[in-house]
Interface confidence: low
């Protein structure tokens, strides 16, 4: 891999062992200034595998609010607007990083945590495994 | 909102002003032990709005590798396996938090950053604007 020289202006730290503790500035830099947050906001309703969004709140986590998608149907919506159970609505899941207060209730000490969230739903063809 | 009492065992810090700097333990705690990572791994291929996964690598970011979904078609795959352009494949996007090395190339100093990633694709009915 590429070795990037260490910046001499870095804060000093004993960074020899994992698990390691680092300094993180919580002033979020948003790279999405050019994106329209409403751009995909109605996909949940217009999809052939529509979903509802459920609020998941946890004050010990940063961000404290995460929205979870739950597929509305087992099947997918067909051209007639009916649910077709020959197809399946399934959640698209993604692992994301969050910060968990550790020790609990501490305002300035966190551990990185990986959680699985459902972002939306997609319509898939089922696979049948034929057992010999 | 609920006021949670501060844990007296918290590390000491001057936490008066934003932007604030916090301590983060990078030893990731994975909450997904019960999930099967392969469970949704083939949805990208079986979806009626299939997608390809592109590797996005940035050594100045943590995690350094993020996978981006790109929809394969403008339309959706119909029951005959053909692309139906009466429907649209669209990316499902999610804002996620990453850590950006700041100052650059520092191993132990980061700023929280919000980025928009495409997680997968879903098939939607197009909105047709009728011009009077």
């Amino acid at each position: 891999g590429i070795t990037i020289p260490r910046n001499p202006g870095c804060p000093n730290s004993e960074d020899k062992n994992f698990p390691r503790t680092v300094m993180v500035n919580l002033n979020i830099h948003n790279r999405n200034t050019n994106t329209n947050p409403k751009r995909s906001s109605d996909y949940y309703n217009r999809s052939t595998s529509p979903w509802n969004l459920h609020r998941n709140e946890d004050p010990e986590r940063y961000p404290s609010v995460i929205w979870e998608a739950k597929c509305r149907h087992l099947g997918c919506i067909n051209a007639d607007g009916n649910v077709d159970y020959h197809m399946n609505s399934v959640p698209i899941q993604q692992e994301i990083l969050v910060l968990r207060r550790e020790p609990p209730h501490c305002p300035n000490s966190f551990r990185l945590e990986k959680i699985l969230v459902s972002v939306g739903c997609t319509c898939v063809t089922p696979i049948v495994h034929h057992v010999a | 909102g609920i006021t949670i009492p501060r844990n007296p065992g918290c590390p000491n810090s001057e936490d008066k002003n934003f932007p604030r700097t916090v301590m983060v333990n990078l030893n990731i705690h994975n909450r997904n032990t019960n999930t099967n990572p392969k469970r949704s791994s083939d949805y990208y291929n079986r979806s009626t709005s299939p997608w390809n996964l592109h590797r996005n690598e940035d050594p100045e970011r943590y995690p350094s590798v993020i996978w981006e979904a790109k929809c394969r078609h403008l339309g959706c795959i119909n029951a005959d396996g053909n692309v139906d352009y009466h429907m649209n494949s669209v990316p499902i996007q999610q804002e996620i938090l990453v850590l950006r090395r700041e100052p650059p190339h520092c191993p132990n100093s980061f700023r929280l950053e919000k980025i928009l990633v495409s997680v997968g694709c879903t098939c939607v009915t197009p909105i047709v604007h009728h011009v009077a």
Epitope: L74, D84, Y85, N88, V124, P126, H129 | N34
Partner: antibody, heavy 125, light 107 residues
Framework: EVQLVESGGGLVQPGGSLRLSCAAS????????MAWVRQAPGKGLEWVAT????????YYRDSVKGRFTISRDNAKNSLYLQMNSLRAEDTAVYYC??????????????????WGQGTLVTVSS | AIQLTQSPSSLSASVGDRVTITCRAD??????MHWYQQKPGKAPKLLIY???NSEIGVPDRFSGSGSGTDFRLTISSLQPEDFATYYC?????????FGQGTKVEIK
């Protein structure tokens, strides 16, 4: 080996309530959609309700909508059917049913490969 | 609701006979048709799933065929243990529906 054991059946008066339970073992319960199917004495099979693995989606036959509630406790590997405002026509053997394990279409497999022994619900005054 | 009509409602046959039971749906159920066997006082047993796939452990004298709206369960050579009631089930559309049953009796 998949095992489904129903309990909670019995005699109840019209308008009364009953809660059926189904204890499941031998498969990853939380991954699978589950169902209740009933059979009135001397009659055919009748699907009653289905619940998705996560519990987020439930489906009912019209005649029980608003009266019956299907639910699950994935931590306890248990399926439930809360039956309220019971009627004489609800008299039946109630079976808990689970899908096959070899079908990997999605999180949901929708036909019934495994059945419990059934529990009899009698609604009579 | 999709209605399934089985025929015949009952039949008498001898050991060794070839028996065919039909199930007709009043609209297409694609390939989401399944067949069950039930004996008195027992839970139903899955025989055939998705039109023509035999469940594990089911003797190969049982076979399924059909598509769309018309489906058949065939027992190529009836055995003493096959005397039972047979049901078709569609899981294409909620509410899921069963046929009214076909009782196979000894002649």
């Amino acid at each position: 080996e998949v095992q489904l054991v129903e309990s909670g059946g019995g005699l109840v008066q019209p308008g009364g309530s009953l809660r059926l339970s189904c204890a499941a073992s031998g498969f990853p319960f939380s991954t699978y959609a589950m169902a209740w199917v009933r059979q009135a004495p001397g009659k055919g099979l009748e699907w009653v309700a289905t619940i998705r693995g996560s519990g987020e989606s439930t489906y009912y036959r019209d005649s029980v909508k608003g009266r019956f509630t299907i639910s699950r406790d994935n931590a306890k590997n248990s399926l439930y059917l809360q039956m309220n405002s019971l009627r004489a026509e609800d008299t039946a053997v109630y079976y808990c049913a689970s899908p096959p394990q070899y079908y990997e279409g999605s999180i949901d497999r929708l036909w019934f490969a495994h059945w419990g022994q059934g529990t009899l619900v009698t609604v009579s005054s | 609701a999709i209605q399934l009509t089985q025929s015949p409602s009952s039949l008498s046959a001898s050991v060794g006979d070839r028996v065919t039971i039909t199930c007709r749906a009043d609209e297409s159920v694609r390939t989401l048709m399944h067949w069950y066997q039930q004996k008195p006082g027992k839970a139903p047993k899955l025989l055939i799933y998705l039109v023509s796939n035999s469940e594990i452990g089911v003797p190969d004298r049982f076979s399924g065929s059909g598509s769309g709206t018309d489906f058949r369960l065939t027992i190529s050579s009836l055995q003493p243990e096959d005397f039972a009631t047979y049901y078709c089930l569609q899981t294409y559309s909620y509410p899921f529906t069963f046929g009214q049953g076909t009782k196979v009796e000894i002649k």
